[in-house]
Interface confidence: low
């Protein structure tokens, strides 16, 4: 078996750094090489070097090694910034703790346990001995530093300068004692570089022997330095990939700090009544998921087995069966007491009003100049100057650069839904910021709701009750499946995008969902030739309070005779009252022997004021809602059809003008349905489609 020993994991890397010797007597050796690994191997073996190598610099531009008999802690040396340089320092010479028996310890402690100064190894006074530096090459018997050249039980020791005491061990702590972490170590940035069984960790920037996704450049905030133990993925404690090809990864033995409190920077803001960001700090007592199913206790393994236990996730407050977000999901969740539903989001918990004092915006926030720099999901905003190319891609005027300072939330594109920012996360290129409109600000973002100013033309599940079966040209209609059962409707608005409602997603796991296209029968019977089944790759939640979701498909739908897209209306348009529209869905239809066929119910548009009267004044509609009433009493959408469309025709063009969402009644006589008004969110939809990456067909 041919395998070169790779020793680069024994070095601490400082990127873009070199060492400059102030003391001209210090030696340096240089040579042209291809990689930093080659420099490391030679430094570790001291091969062909006239000194003990303690550090090296790899010059990436010249492909050159500079080997040093000193490191950044040595006198006569200073650190200097340099783009093309990476400094690697042998950890043994900068570590102030020992691993195991301390055989590799090469630090500078030179005092014994009882405080006696050590005798130099090259001296025979006051004690004669055979531990000569020349006899123990590679054991670094330098000066009078504590060492353990034979790997004896007590750890590093030295001959003492006291003639009465021949030798004594030195009080150098174990690295596992020095290193400690809080909670489950997600914020741990210590220097532990071996696992609990003593295996040396693989460098995060290496892919041998184990290839992995945790590349330092891809996750700059995860602290993937050298080969130190980290917890980037919400495990119970820090871990690392190992250099043992037979053991991909292992946990590290890092004890919990005595004062187990998190740094201020790591603490999510604790809330009890509402969710801030992704709700990692939610500490309230809601204990059911969105649809009322009770949560399973975190300390119970029934009905669902899991490792999200209070012991594994300290500091995450996994008490009782309360909704929590211990793993950085998009919002609080829990395992459920229903054996058929493993997990669910507690999406009924409201979002906190994040505006503090003056941090609010007027109108659509285009003049907001506050200094918030975080998105509503808790992502840090990235600098505007790094994203100008992307910004120019979706606006057709020159943005006011004087407003786009740092990474503060801004609204350079006149977005109707407030300030936003780019994130630097390729999956979520941009998102809105958690800033509210200022209290009392009634500036409408769209005017003249009930008067047709802008034409809509250019253009999806609640159950449709008492509707008529349909087969004609409804290729944009999507059946969203949850664990292989129909749960919601949706509209295919682009080959890779489905518009639906946020209430359609009870589970955190996208693998639980599929989109069925091209079907007429809810079970797909007789639709085999035309049916397309697509996985879901991402959910993009609409602006605050919209109840909309854009669901990204894992691959684009193939448009054919059975699958087509439906148009979106113009932004801010209004459709004339009494315009005839339709809602579609597969939900329960009021018939005893329901045949599972897609139904349509015909409705007509009703102005918001009149709609409010029909609801006996109990409902005030705003600019983000649209109302439609039934021509036939008791015909309209209900709960199997949430996410489905209200489709209207204007100038011979069919468009999705509304989305069916829960909470507004179910085909009650004389009670028109209230839908999410797609025209109000059309710019947001276009912006997502334009800026989010989708798989190519």
């Amino acid at each position: 078996q041919r395998k070169r020993r790779n020793t680069i994991h024994e070095f601490k890397k400082s990127a873009k750094t070199t060492l400059i010797k102030i003391d001209p007597a210090l030696k340096i050796k240089t040579k042209k090489v291809n990689t930093a690994d080659q420099c490391a191997n030679r430094c570790t073996r001291n091969k062909g070097l006239p000194f003990t190598c303690k550090a090296f610099v790899f010059d990436k531009a010249r492909k050159q090694c500079l080997w040093f008999p000193f490191n950044s802690m040595s006198s006569g040396v200073k650190k200097e910034f340099g783009h093309e340089f990476d400094l690697y320092e042998n950890k043994d010479y900068i570590r102030n703790c020992i691993i195991g028996k301390g055989r590799s310890y090469k630090g500078t402690v030179s005092i014994t346990k009882s405080g006696i100064k050590c005798q130099p190894w090259s001296s025979m006074i006051p004690h004669e001995h055979s531990f000569l530096p020349s006899s123990y090459r590679g054991k670094d018997l330098q000066e009078n530093y504590c060492r353990n050249p034979r790997g004896e039980e007590g750890g590093p020791w030295c001959f003492t300068s006291n003639p009465e005491v021949r030798y004594e061990v030195c009080d150098i702590p174990q690295c596992s004692e020095v290193e400690c972490m809080t909670c489950n170590g997600e914020s741990y940035r210590g220097l532990m570089d071996h696992t609990e069984s003593g295996k040396i960790c693989q460098r995060w920037d290496h892919q041998t022997p184990h290839r992995h996704k945790f590349l330092p450049e891809r996750y700059p905030d995860k602290g993937f330095d050298d080969n130190y133990c980290r917890n980037p993925d919400g495990q119970p404690r820090p871990w690392c990939y190992t250099l043992d090809p037979h053991t991909r990864w292992e946990y590290c033995a890092i004890k919990t700090c005595a004062d187990n409190t998190m740094n201020d920077t790591d603490v999510p803001l604790e809330t009890t009544e509402c969710i801030q960001g992704q709700g990692e700090g939610y500490r309230g007592t809601v204990n059911t998921i969105w649809n009322g199913i009770p949560c399973q206790r975190w300390d119970s393994q029934y009905p669902h087995e899991h490792d999200m236990t209070p012991e594994n996730f300290k500091c995450k407050d996994l008490r009782e069966n309360y909704c929590r977000n211990p793993d950085g999901s998009e919002s609080p969740w829990c395992f459920t007491t229903d054996p058929n539903i493993r997990v669910g989001y507690c999406s009924q918990i409201p979002n906190c009003d994040m505006s503090h004092g003056q941090d609010c915006y007027r109108g659509n926030g285009k003049n907001y100049m506050g200094n918030l720099s975080q998105t509503r999901s808790g992502l840090t905003c990235s600098m505007w100057d790094k994203n100008m190319e992307d910004l120019h891609r979706h606006i057709f005027w020159e943005p006011d650069a004087s407003k786009l300072n740092e990474n503060y939330c801004r609204n350079p594109d006149d977005d109707a839904h407030g300030p936003w920012c780019y994130t630097g996360n390729p999956l979520i290129p941009w998102d809105y910021c958690p800033i509210s409109r200022c209290e009392g600000d009634t500036t409408p973002t769209i005017v003249n709701l009930d008067h047709p100013v802008i034409s809509c033309a250019k253009t999806k599940q609640l159950r449709v009750v008492n509707g008529i079966p349909t087969r004609t040209n409804i290729g944009w209609m999507v059946s969203l499946r949850y664990r292989n059962k129909h749960i919601c409707g949706g509209s295919l608005i682009k080959e890779s995008w489905v518009l639906t409602a946020r209430q359609c997603f009870p589970s955190r796991d996208l693998k639980d969902y599929e989109a069925w296209l091209g079907i007429h029968d809810v079970h797909g019977r007789g639709d085999e030739k035309c049916k397309q089944v697509l996985n879901v790759s991402q959910l993009v939640y609409g602006p605050e309070g919209s109840d909309l979701v854009l669901m990204k498909l894992a691959r684009p739908a193939v448009l054919d005779d059975f699958v087509s897209t439906i148009d979106l209306p113009n932004y801010g348009c209004t459709i004339p009252e009494k315009t005839s529209c339709s809602v579609y869905g597969w939900g329960y239809t009021g018939l005893i022997n329901y045949d599972g066929l897609l139904r349509v119910a015909h409705l007509y548009i009703m102005g918001n004021e009149k709609c409010s009267q029909h609801h006996r004044g109990k409902v005030t509609l705003n600019e983000s809602e649209i109302c439609a009433g039934a021509e036939k009493i008791g015909s309209g959408p209900c709960e199997g059809d949430y996410g489905g469309p209200l489709v209207c025709e204007q100038h011979k063009m069919r468009m999705v003008l509304g989305v069916i969402v829960p909470g507004r009644g179910c085909a009650i006589p004389n009670r028109p349905g209230i839908f999410v008004r797609v025209a109000y969110y059309a710019k947001w939809i276009h912006k997502i489609i334009l800026t989010y990456k989708v798989p190519q067909s």
């Epitope: 078996q1 041919r2 395998k3 892919q207």
Partner: antibody
Framework: QVQLVESGGGLVKPGGSLRLSCAAS????????MSWIRQAPGKGLEWVSY????????YYADSVKGRFTISRDNAKNSLYLQMNSLRAEDTAVYYC???????????????WGQGTLVTVSS | DIQMTQSPSSVSASVGDRVTITCRAS??????LAWYQQKPGKAPNLLIY???SLQSGVPSRFGGSGSGTDFTLTISSLQPEDFATYYC?????????FGQGTKVEIK
């Protein structure tokens, strides 16, 4: 498109030697880690050996260690398996497989050759 | 070495049926598991990687789940071309090991 074509299989007596080749095309061979995997008649799959893209890292299954040698020639887009001291239990179809880097996620065999049959019998 | 045990060793099913195959690892392998399909006289074909990610070009009726030691391959609606032998493979560490295979036959 990606293609892997094995050759060099045949009938050999116990204790004999054989050299298998795998010709790669349709992708940048020198960027990929490669493996040999075998399947005895009517049996399951057994991973045999692995070589990194540069050839500097090599691993073998215990059952072949010391007898088989994996190598590659990136200039010729070829992977090799030198098999010495062959035994009856080495009889199998030998596949060469590309180990897809998959954007840095982990090891998996995304393309396989059609296989070459090695029969060890007296 | 990590042992991979598949069950059942064979299953008889009809077109349209939902088929589930399980794979158990002798020790925890996180999500480092792949599923392959092999038809007689042909090379294996990668279906699922990292326990649940669908390899491009594979029909969405194939799905994978699980982590740790227990994994499942599900074919939601069996098609005529799905009759084959299925193997799981762990990629947690060398030596990479496969399950003994599960043959899906026509009932």
């Amino acid at each position: 498109q990606v293609q892997l074509v094995e050759s060099g299989g045949g009938l050999v007596k116990p204790g004999g030697s054989l050299r298998l080749s795998c010709a790669a095309s349709g992708f940048t061979f020198s960027d990929y880690y490669m493996s040999w995997i075998r399947q005895a008649p009517g049996k399951g799959l057994e991973w045999v050996s692995y070589i990194s893209s540069s050839g500097s890292t090599i691993y073998y299954a215990d059952s072949v260690k010391g007898r088989f040698t994996i190598s590659r020639d990136n200039a010729k887009n070829s992977l090799y398996l030198q098999m010495n001291s062959l035994r009856a239990e080495d009889t199998a179809v030998y596949y060469c497989a590309r180990d897809e880097y998959n954007s840095g996620w982990y090891v998996l065999f995304d393309y396989w050759g059609q296989g070459t049959l090695v029969t060890v019998s007296s | 070495d990590i042992q991979m045990t598949q069950s059942p060793s064979s299953v008889s099913a009809s077109v349209g049926d939902r088929v589930t195959i399980t794979c158990r690892a002798s020790q925890g392998i996180s999500s480092w598991l792949a599923w392959y399909q092999q038809k007689p006289g042909k090379a294996p074909n990668l279906l699922i990687y990292e326990a649940s990610s669908l390899q491009s070009g594979v029909p969405s009726r194939f799905g994978g789940s699980g982590s740790g030691t227990d994994f499942t391959l599900t074919i939601s609606s069996l098609q005529p071309e799905d009759f084959a032998t299925y193997y799981c493979q762990q990629a947690n560490g060398f030596p990479w090991t496969f399950g003994q295979g599960t043959k899906v036959e026509i009932k």
